[in-house]
């Protein structure tokens, strides 16, 4: 009986010779559980596993802890890959995180973190980031040191408020912090002075809600 080839991330898929961007099936480390992800095989050498994407507001990102844990949306469009998979993946290997951003004026920018991982669910999928470079700000818009993940039904932030309810979306809120890529999607000309938009402060400043965002990861030794 022929053994089925499994891939833990898009870098493995790329190295296997499959170099076309698209949806692929990934397998949880040390498990048979599978998840569908979008693999970007074109950006900066390819092999990127997309863990978040926003582009048109077609998917509601004001979701529960369970939904953010397991993932939601469509890998062909807007989606969240899932905290549990990303946590397991990044705890066993050193990964870089690239965040690609687009504004409504036609500009693009990125932030690249040379080491990224999520703690497990017992630590509320706390984010860990080091080594920031890129064009989307010299200061990290994800608060440092990393915060716990919060959702509308699981408040783990450092605010007297409930950031996820106030700003909408699940995110690594501080109190509430300089970013929220899972905020409310606002169309062009309605995207400024927003208290709950898609925010990356150290690129576009306060109240500016972005047009598109992509978070993607790849092994550091790719």
């Amino acid at each position: 009986k022929e053994e089925k080839t499994t891939f833990r991330d898009c870098a493995e898929i790329f190295k296997s010779g499959l170099t076309t961007s698209g949806i692929y099936t990934l397998t949880f480390p040390n498990s048979t559980e599978e998840v569908k992800a979008y693999c970007d095989m074109d950006m900066g050498g390819g092999g990127w596993t997309v863990i978040q994407h926003r582009e048109d507001g077609s998917v509601d990102f004001q979701r529960t802890w369970k939904e953010y844990k397991e993932g939601f949306g469509s890998p062909l469009g807007e989606y969240w890959l899932g905290n549990e998979f990303v946590s397991q993946l990044t705890s066993g290997h050193r990964y870089v995180l690239k965040i690609q951003l687009k504004d409504w004026e036609g500009s693009e920018a990125h932030s690249l973190y040379e080491h990224f991982y999520l703690s497990g669910e017992e630590s509320n999928y706390r984010i860990h980031l080091t080594g920031l470079t890129g064009t989307a700000g010299k200061i990290s818009s994800i608060s440092q040191p990393g915060s716990d993940f919060s959702t509308k039904d699981s408040d783990n932030d450092k605010c007297i408020c409930k950031c996820s309810q106030m700003l909408t979306g699940g995110w690594w809120f501080d109190a509430c912090g300089p970013s929220n890529l899972n905020g409310q999607y606002y169309p062009q000309k309605q995207n400024t002075n927003k208290f709950n938009g898609i925010k990356w402060y150290y690129w576009k400043g306060s109240g500016y809600s972005l047009k598109a965002t992509t978070m993607m990861i790849r092994p550091a030794d790719f």
């Epitope: 408020c161 950031c163 109190a175 927003k194 306060s206 109240g207």
Partner: nanobody, 129 residues
Framework: EVQLVESGGGLVQPGGSLRLSCAAS????????IGWFRQAPGKEREGVSA????????YYADSVKGRFTISSDNSKNTVYLQMNSLRPEDTAVYYC??????????????????????WGQGTLVTVSS
């Protein structure tokens, strides 16, 4: 739609006074804090004063304490900054900005700059003889 409109800027001699107004629309002051910020040419934007209308709490930067007074009129949805004993170093564009009042870190009294998500266009204050 959230809007903040500043007015009251102008040219004033050293030692003089001005009163800036910040008219808010699209939200009520009861649930928000309003901050006044200023930016001089070639310098970073800095916090000057802030007020939480609901609790009446106020904040002042050390450089303006005793000279500036912040107040609000919730019936007009407007915040004021009374500036007395003005100095040449007070010359800047003055902005007002809003933040939901509850967006506070445990144990803190005021808000970092990045929490203010709604901004006005600014009004120029020039202090010169």
């Amino acid at each position: 739609e959230v809007q903040l409109v500043e007015s009251g800027g102008g040219l004033v001699q050293p030692g003089g006074s001005l009163r800036l107004s910040c008219a808010a629309s699209g939200f009520t002051l009861d649930d928000y804090a309003i901050g006044w910020f200023r930016q001089a040419p070639g310098k970073e934007r800095e916090g000057v004063s802030a007020i939480r209308s609901s609790g009446g709490s106020t904040y002042y930067a050390d450089s303006v304490k005793g000279r500036f007074t912040i107040s609000s009129d919730n019936s007009k949805n407007t915040v004021y900054l009374q500036m007395n004993s003005l100095r040449p170093e007070d010359t800047a564009v003055y902005y007002c900005a809003a933040v939901p009042a509850g967006r506070l870190r445990f144990g803190e009294q005021w808000y970092p700059l990045y929490e203010y998500d709604a901004w006005g266009q600014g009004t120029l204050v020039t202090v010169s003889s």
